[in-house]
């Protein structure tokens, strides 16, 4: 009688991470007495992955009955693959001997590969925020995908980028790998509604790519213009001046008025406006009682914004001669907030 | 689901032999090897050895080698093993277990004059 | 034949406690064939780890199970006080197959 083959039919079998995988193999003859086993691997250190007869395999499962008199098929089902099941499965007849079971005949392997989803991207920005004008690094990962091929884009407001490296890890063979990518944006003063998007491609996507996405009003700040204005006079002895805070992001904005080096008021920005491009605006007033002043007065509006160093400006207000007007709102769009006399 | 139930304690005394049944339910031992385990009291475990129903082929330890036989009835679904010339040092716990991932409930057996 | 040897042969914790549980093969065992069992008093084993690292249905994920050729560990992060009991390694990669002569984890 011909001797017994072990037949592998599938050279590979390729599945998608979460599903079952099917490994055919069959024998050609009974003989020899003694169970099949399939393996991961070959050698010494192959993985034992089903024993027909003893030890516990919870995610294996037979095609057919194997212990059916005249039963050939050895084919399995290993459920719920993951990318970790990945490598080259060999069934292996064994003749049964003493005192161990001795392999008699192996069949040629099917390499089982898995093809497993890269997990949604996720983008990072700078840790401090950064003004217009200066480049900033965004990062982008995701993990877990199989195959090694994956493609990944970098856009800003729908624009590609280009200034950007990436690398797939490991470089080597491995049952999933992770991109990591770093993009250089440019920040401009328009950026506050502005996004940077990560978009990964990869073959189980099935042409429907992932993206991650950041928002630049989390990494961008926008430094207040000031405009300090004297208005006209209110009544007989009383100034009015303004502090325009123009075009700043974000809102955490404190203004302090100093009169003469002293500090007049402080306040923290509230009811702001904001502009089409999500800055805001933001105008403090100041009602100075000129009688109570026998020289020349200088008015600083101080604006600590978001942390940084105050910025300010000045107005010299005479007071010499009868007051009158000494400049005029240009800010139609903004409302005053805070009156207060100076005595 | 799985079951294996065992036959009830024995009380024997050396020399004798005795006889534990272990009846499955839920598969068929044909599918599985089924073995024996020992466990003297405070003691740890010991294989025994097993049996491929299917065949009838079995594997022994050393040490139970020559007093121990194992058999299987298919048609009960039934393993069985018989233990002889027992000692005072055969007194324990005796387990069958289905391909070693199902453990039977256990019987006792006690070997004393 | 390959012997198993647990160590230690006790280990008193609290609960709460990290537990490691040692088992060292007298020759090489392939990792697939390297199982842990639970026994409490009174009860048979329950097979706990099987093929060295994979928790048996129903194992809490406090469990783990690592090593290779000759030596292999049972990891409990934190001990909950169903935990304590004899903890048997057990090897099936040639016969005659052996046990370890157990670790009793008892409360401190």
């Known amino acids: 009688e011909e001797e017994l083959q072990v037949i592998q039919p599938d050279k590979s079998v390729l599945v998608a991470a979460g599903e079952t995988a099917t490994l055919r193999c069959t024998a050609t003859s009974l003989i020899p007495v003694g169970p099949i086993q399939w393996f991961r691997g070959a050698g010494p250190g192959r993985e034992l992955i089903y024993n027909q007869k003893e030890g516990h395999f919870p995610r294996v499962t037979t095609v057919s009955d194997l212990t059916k008199r005249n039963n050939m098929d050895f084919s399995i089902r290993i459920g719920n693959i993951t990318p970790a099941d990945a490598g080259t499965y060999y069934c292996v007849k064994f003749r049964k001997g003493s005192p161990d079971d001795v392999e008699f005949k192996s069949g040629a392997g099917t390499e089982l590969s898995v093809r497993a989803k890269p997990s949604a991207p996720v983008v990072s920005g700078p840790a401090a925020r950064a003004t217009p004008q200066h480049t900033v690094s965004f990062t982008c990962e995701s993990h877990g995908f199989s195959p090694r091929d994956i493609t990944l884009k970098w856009f800003k407001n729908g624009n590609e980028l280009s200034d950007f490296q990436t690398n797939v890890d490991p470089v080597g063979e491995s049952v999933s790998y992770s991109i990591h990518s770093t993009a250089k944006v440019v920040l401009t003063r328009e950026d506050v509604h502005s996004q940077v998007i990560c978009e990964v491609a990869h073959v189980t996507l099935q042409g429907d790519p992932l993206r991650g996405t950041a928002n630049l009003s989390e990494t961008i700040r926008v430094p207040p213009t000031l405009e300090v204005t004297q208005q006209p006079v209110r009544a007989e002895n009383q100034v009015n001046v303004t502090c325009q805070v123009r075009k700043f992001y974000p809102q955490r904005l404190q203004l302090t008025w100093l009169e003469n080096g002293n500090v007049s008021r402080t306040e923290t920005a509230s009811t702001v406006t904001e502009n089409k491009d999500g800055t805001y605006n933001w105008m403090s007033w100041l009602l100075v009682n000129v009688s109570a002043h026998r020289d020349d007065v200088k008015l600083t509006c101080q604006v600590e914004h978001d942390g940084q160093p105050a910025v300010s400006k000045s107005h010299d207000l005479k007071v010499s001669a009868h007051p009158k007007e000494q400049g005029s709102n240009t800010a139609a769009e903004n409302t005053g907030s805070n009156e207060r006399n100076i005595y | 689901e799985v079951q294996l139930v065992q036959s009830g304690a024995e009380v024997k005394k050396p020399g004798a032999t005795v006889k534990i049944s272990c009846k499955a339910s839920?598969?068929?031992?044909?599918?599985?090897?089924m073995h024996w385990v020992q466990q003297a009291p405070g003691k740890g475990l010991e294989w025994i050895g097993r049996?491929?129903?299917?065949?009838?082929?079995?594997k022994y330890a050393p040490k139970f080698q020559g007093r121990v036989t194992i058999t299987a009835d298919t048609s009960t679904n039934t393993a069985y093993m018989e233990l002889s010339s027992l000692r005072s040092e055969d007194t324990a716990v005796y387990y069958c277990?289905?391909?070693?991932?199902?453990w039977g409930q256990g019987t006792l057996v006690t070997v004393s004059s | 034949e390959i012997v198993l040897t647990q160590s230690p042969a006790t280990l008193s914790l609290s609960p709460g406690e990290r537990a490691t549980l040692s088992c060292s093969a007298s020759?090489?065992?392939?990792?697939?064939?390297l199982y842990w069992y639970q026994q409490k008093p009174g009860q048979a084993p329950k097979l706990w780890i099987y093929?060295?690292?994979n928790l048996a249905s129903g194992i809490p994920a406090r469990f783990s199970g690592s090593g290779s050729g000759t030596d292999f560990t049972l990891t409990i992060s934190s001990l909950e006080p169903e935990d304590f009991a004899v903890y048997y390694c057990?090897?099936?990669?040639?016969?005659?197959?052996?046990f370890g002569q157990g670790t009793k984890l008892e409360i401190k």
């Open positions: 839920g598969f068929n031992i044909k599918d599985y090897y």
């Open positions: 277990d289905r391909g070693l991932a199902y």
């Open positions: 049996i491929d129903p299917e065949d009838a082929e079995t």
């Open positions: 057990h090897q099936w990669s040639s016969y005659p197959y052996t």
């Open positions: 020759s090489s065992v392939s990792s697939s064939y």
């Open positions: 093929s060295t690292s």
